[in-house]
């Protein structure tokens, strides 16, 4: 024998109190699949959470975080504080990047500046808390008497005329 509840579509529940007829989910509840014996309570996006998608009879509400915070966890279960560029989030809040490190985003950790000398290059622009160093030509290229080499012209993509 087929279970009569299997005929109840999403957005309804199989009401045992009413001879297993399909009843619509009450307000602020939903069922995302058919054949459900109860409807689930809609998630409420309150406080630091804000509503990204309203609850409907067939799908739960979806939350994201208010400005100054970003989502963490499955389905944005947590809102973690943003920091400023040049900072990283620690257990006790936002802290400035230590000298020699940088962070150019509002989240994540401070990363060490690039070591230009490992690639045989010199520092063209110093690093800051917000920006990595910019590496320039190798020191040998800058020494007096070094032959100047004109770099080859970049190849044009087909169909692009020169500016």
């Amino acid at each position: 024998l087929q279970d009569p509840c299997s005929n109840c579509p999403a957005g309804t529940f199989c009401d045992n109190n009413r001879n297993q007829i399909c009843s619509p989910c009450p307000p602020n509840s939903f069922s995302s699949a058919g054949g459900q014996r109860t409807c689930d309570i809609c998630r409420q996006c309150k406080g630091v959470f804000r509503t990204r998608k309203e609850c409907s009879s067939t799908s739960n509400a979806e939350c994201d975080c208010t400005p100054g915070f970003h989502c963490l966890g499955a389905g944005c279960s947590m809102c973690e504080q943003d920091c400023k560029q040049g900072q990283e989030l620690t257990k006790k809040g936002c802290k400035d990047c230590c000298f020699g490190t940088f962070n150019d985003q509002k989240r994540g950790i401070c990363r060490p500046w690039t070591n230009c000398s490992l690639d045989g290059k010199s520092v063209l622009v110093n690093g800051t808390k917000e920006r990595d160093v910019v590496c320039g030509p190798s020191p040998a290229d800058l020494s007096p008497g070094a032959s100047s080499v004109t770099p080859p012209a970049p190849a044009r993509e087909p169909g692009h005329s020169p500016q």
Partner: nanobody
Framework: EVQLLESGGGLVQPGGSLRLSCAAS????????MSWFRQPPETGLQWVSS????????YYADSVKGRFTISRDNSKNTLYLQMNSLRAEDTAVYYC?????????????????WGQGTTVTVSS
């Protein structure tokens, strides 16, 4: 699959106590530091407490120091948070978290797995 499952939350009156548990599976529990975080309704995620892999090193946020105690039982793969003298401002969803290494401190964190959370409501 690495999993963390919290339990022990509930409604408690101000001044009361609760003990949260976090059952861990899918990794060598004793090799990793563990932490508790909380998500209050009105503001961002807050770090609560951390414990090293062996259980020797423990750290607490100033707001819970002297009231909360973190512990772990590596033979049972379980993390605990004993919460005493609870206040209304402790109301939050509490999350168990696995850190990426054995050691920990009260500064940097490197959480790579979160539990699903357990709700603690402190109200008269």
């Amino acid at each position: 699959e690495v999993q963390l499952l919290e339990s022990g939350g509930g409604l408690v009156q101000p001044g009361g106590s609760l003990r949260l548990s976090c059952a861990a599976s899918g990794f060598t529990f004793s090799s990793y530091a563990m932490s508790w975080f909380r998500q209050p309704p009105e503001t961002g995620l807050q770090w609560v407490s951390s414990i090293g892999g062996s259980g020797g090193d423990t750290y607490y946020a100033d707001s819970v120091k002297g009231r909360f105690t973190i512990s772990r039982d590596n033979s049972k793969n379980t993390l605990y948070l004993q919460m005493n003298s609870l206040r209304a401002e402790d109301t939050a969803v509490y999350y168990c978290a696995k850190e990426g290494s054995n050691g920990t401190d009260d500064n940097y964190y490197d959480v790579d797995v979160w539990g699903q959370g357990t709700t603690v409501t402190v109200s008269s």
